[in-house]
């Protein structure tokens, strides 16, 4: 069997949801000593980067200029050390947002509910789209989908304090082209005092894996980075359409 290097990790810097005409940044974390990284889009070569000096850098950033629906889709990366190529990374789905119109998000029975109540979000967009997406702030990878002609509903069932937080919705014109985001709706779930004080609240910062962790080698960093790479390849997960 042909020998290959371990697959790199591909990430979007800050977010995989990129407003149209803005620049996206993807990171490919490979290995110290890699002389070339390649970014592939829908199976075709999109960009090349050759780090300098290769032995001091464990990954590269790829900038995707002027984001639009023709550059939204599935990206992957590979790297080379000498003549030996790595396996392909997992696929990363890059989405263009701020296309066309803005939906309206509402919640029933209201934004302030008690623990155990049934809650439903409604996302409405009058232009032609059939798929709607609901995202919770700080949980952008956990996308809920629903379908409808101009409105979709997202039944949450009986809520707990874990459902507290800010929500936005999008209309989707295809898997990779989304509308402007709705205005946020903040859901406040109150429980009894004991539950509320112990209930974990979701972080409002972006997902931790939506961050580039590229390093320059100094001393022990090479060993640490190798451990980090192996661990993250083992635990890394990403959303699928």
């Amino acid at each position: 069997p042909k020998q290959t290097l371990p697959k790199p990790i591909i990430r979007a810097e800050s977010t995989y949801m990129v407003p149209k005409e803005k620049q996206a940044t993807l990171c490919c974390q490979g290995s110290y000593g890699a002389v070339e990284y390649q970014l592939h889009f829908e199976g075709s070569l999109f960009a090349v980067e050759r780090p300098k000096p290769p032995e001091r850098i464990n990954g590269v950033k790829f900038h995707i200029p002027d984001m639009n629906s023709r550059k939204a889709g599935r990206y992957s990366c590979i790297y080379r050390v000498g003549e030996l190529w790595s396996e392909r990374s997992d696929l990363l789905d890059l989405v263009v947002t701020e296309m066309y119109d803005t939906p309206t998000l509402s919640v029933h029975p209201g934004p302030e509910v008690t623990s155990g109540e049934k809650v439903t979000f409604y996302c409405r967009l009058d232009t032609a789209t059939s798929m709607f997406l609901l995202l919770k702030e700080g949980r952008s990878r956990d996308v809920q989908r629903s379908y409808g002609k101009v409105q979709a509903e997202f039944p949450m069932g009986p809520v707990t304090t874990a459902h507290r937080g800010s929500y936005r919705c999008f209309g989707s014109y295809n898997n990779y082209a989304w509308s402007f985001p709705s205005e946020p709706v903040k859901l406040l779930v109150t429980g009894d005092i004991e539950n509320t004080s112990l209930a974990p609240t979701d972080p409002t910062f972006p997902d931790s894996w939506d961050t580039c962790l590229l390093t320059r080698e100094t001393g022990l960093q090479k060993d640490l980075a190798l451990w980090d790479h192996t661990a993250q390849n083992h635990h890394h997960h990403h959303h699928h359409h």
């Epitope: 090349v48 980067e49 023709r70």
Partner: nanobody, 127 residues
Amino acid sequence: QVQLVESGGGLIQAGGSLRLSCVASERSLTLYAMGWFRQAPGLEREFVAGISRTGDTTYSPDSVKGRFTISRDNAKNVLYLQMNSLKPDDTAVYYCAASATYSATNIYTHQRAYGDWGQGTQVTVSS
């Protein structure tokens, strides 16, 4: 946006050399990663060579590697493609393209990465 004008094409014997130029008007080319593509009749547009904003890094596919060399002169706002050992298969319209990018070092190989295109210059290699 940047206006791009190619020149240097023509009819050449197999084995000969040509140098294509691409001049950018108005905006400074230092803001752009650049590339050369070609399109033969009835075929898809094909990537031929790419160069980073700084000019430090270049990339070409195997089909032209060792024969075609891309370079740039940012002071003069010109992109070049030196084509040696030309073959009849190299006959095509050659286009230069520019991609406004934050990256000083990325090289783009995909048509969709490029926002600005020239009108093209015809290269015909006779046997």
